[in-house]
C-alpha cells in the first residue's frame, strides 16, 4: 500500500513539475528590467528564451522573436536546449511511468516489470530536474553577470552613433517558477526510485522437491543415473529415498563426490 | 546591426512644410520609442518629440504644437510632419530609436547620422 501512495504521490509531483518546467520555457519573464521613466511613459521591458517584450504603462505590450539562431549567445542555446531535453525526457518519464503504476493493469506486466519502468522513470524525472535546474541556473549567472552592461559607453556604427544604456536586468517570474518545477520533478523522480524497491519481487529461495512414487523407493546410481526398483540387492547404490517428497533441507546430506541432488 | 536612414530634410521658406521620415533595419526587438532631436549651430542637441509603440508622444518645450510625430510600427518607421517652420527651425535633425535587447545587449539608443532641415527665406 505503501509502495502505490509513493508511486502514485511521485508520479503526480513529477507531473506538476514537468508542467511547470514546460510553462516556464515558455514564458517570455525569465529576466526584467524595472520600470523607467523614460522621456515618453513608464516602460517595463522583459525578455524570454524565445522573444523579447516591451510593456507600455498604457497597457500596450509589443514582442517580437529573436532575430536569428546563428546570432545568439552560445549560453542562451545552452539554456534553450537544457530546457527541450528538460522537456522531453520528463514526458518520456511520464509516459512510461503511467504504464508503470500499480494501480494500473496492463495485461500480465509482472511486478519486475513494472519495478523497472518504474526505475528507469524515476531516472528519468531526475535528470529532467536537473536539467531545468542547471538551464535556470546558468540564465541567472547570466543575469549577474551583466557582461554587456559595464558601463554606458557611446561608439559609431552603420548609420550613425550607438549609445548603450546603463540598464540593470532582474530574475523574471520564469526562473522561480523553473528552479521550483526543477525540484519538484527532481523529488518526484527520487520517489519514483523509491517505489521501486518496494515494487521489486524479493528473491525468494524456493526448496527443491522432489516426488516419489509412493510404493516404492527409487534408487540412483552414480554409473549413468539407473534407478532400480529397491526389491533386489542394494548393495551399490549409495543412496535411498523412501517415497513420499521431501525438501532438500530435510535430507541429510552425506559428503559424496557421487552426491548429485 | 540595425540601421537608421533618415529622409525628407532640405532647403524650406518660413511657413513652409516638410516631412522627415526614418526608417530602422536589421536586427530589432523590442522598441521603447522613436523620435527626433535637433541640433542648431552651436547650441545643444534638444528634444522635438518623441513616440512610443502604444501611441504616446511627447514635444519639445519651444515647438506650440507645429510638429506631429507618427510612427509605422509594422515598417519600424517614425515621421515627423513639421508645418509652420521659423528661421530658428534650422538644424541637424537627429533620428534616434530606443532598442531593448534584453540579455542579448541591453538597453541601446541608435541615433541617425543626420538630415538638414534649413528655412531660408
Known amino acids: 500500500m505503501a509502495v502505490t501512495a509513493c508511486q502514485g504521490l511521485g508520479f503526480v509531483v513529477s507531473l506538476i513539475g514537468i508542467a511547470g518546467i514546460i510553462a516556464a520555457t515558455c514564458m517570455d519573464q525569465w529576466s526584467t528590467q524595472d520600470l523607467y521613466n523614460n522621456p515618453v511613459t513608464a516602460v517595463f521591458n522583459y525578455q524570454g528564451l524565445w522573444r523579447s517584450c516591451v510593456r507600455e504603462s498604457s497597457g500596450f505590450t509589443e514582442c517580437r522573436g529573436y532575430f536569428t539562431l546563428l546570432g545568439l549567445p552560445a549560453m542562451l542555446q545552452a539554456v534553450r536546449a537544457l530546457m527541450i531535453v528538460g522537456i522531453v525526457l520528463g514526458a518520456i518519464g511520464l509516459l512510461v511511468s503511467i504504464f508503470a503504476l500499480k494501480c494500473i493493469r496492463i495485461g500480465s506486466m509482472e511486478d519486475s516489470a513494472k519495478a523497472n519502468m518504474t526505475l528507469t522513470s524515476g531516472i528519468m524525472f531526475i535528470v529532467s530536474g536537473l536539467c531545468a535546474i542547471a538551464g535556470v541556473s546558468v540564465f541567472a549567472n547570466m543575469l549577474v553577470t551583466n557582461f554587456w552592461m559595464s558601463t554606458a559607453n557611446m561608439y559609431t556604427g552603420m548609420g550613425g552613433m550607438v549609445q548603450t544604456v546603463q540598464t540593470r536586468y532582474t530574475f523574471g517570474a520564469a526562473l522561480f517558477v523553473g528552479w521550483v518545477a526543477g525540484g519538484l520533478t527532481l523529488i518526484g523522480g527520487v520517489m519514483m526510485c523509491i517505489a521501486c524497491r518496494g515494487l521489486a519481487p524479493e528473491e525468494t529461495n524456493y526448496k527443491a522437491v522432489s516426488y516419489h512414487a509412493s510404493g516404492h523407493s527409487v534408487a540412483y546410481k552414480p554409473g549413468g543415473f539407473k534407478a532400480s526398483t529397491g526389491f533386489g540387492s542394494n548393495t551399490k547404490n549409495k543412496k535411498i529415498y523412501d517415497g513420499g517428497a521431501r525438501t532438500e533441507d530435510e535430507v541429510q546430506s552425506y559428503p559424496s563426490k557421487h552426491d548429485y541432488v | 546591426e540595425v540601421q537608421l536612414v533618415e529622409s525628407g530634410g532640405g532647403l524650406v521658406q518660413p511657413g513652409g512644410s516638410l516631412r522627415l521620415s526614418c526608417a530602422a533595419s536589421g536586427n530589432i526587438l523590442s522598441i521603447n520609442y522613436a523620435g527626433w532631436y535637433r541640433q542648431a549651430p552651436g547650441k545643444e542637441r534638444e528634444l522635438v518629440a518623441l513616440?512610443?509603440?502604444?501611441?504616446?508622444?511627447t514635444y519639445g518645450a519651444s515647438l506650440k504644437g507645429r510638429f506631429t510625430i507618427s510612427s509605422d510600427n509594422a515598417k519600424d518607421t517614425v515621421y515627423l510632419q513639421m508645418s509652420s517652420l521659423q528661421p530658428d527651425d534650422t538644424a541637424v535633425y537627429y533620428c534616434n530609436f530606443r532598442i531593448n535587447f534584453g540579455i542579448l545587449g541591453g538597453l541601446r539608443d541608435y541615433w541617425g547620422q543626420g538630415t538638414q532641415v534649413t528655412v531660408s527665406p
Open positions: 513616440i512610443t509603440r502604444g501611441g504616446s508622444t
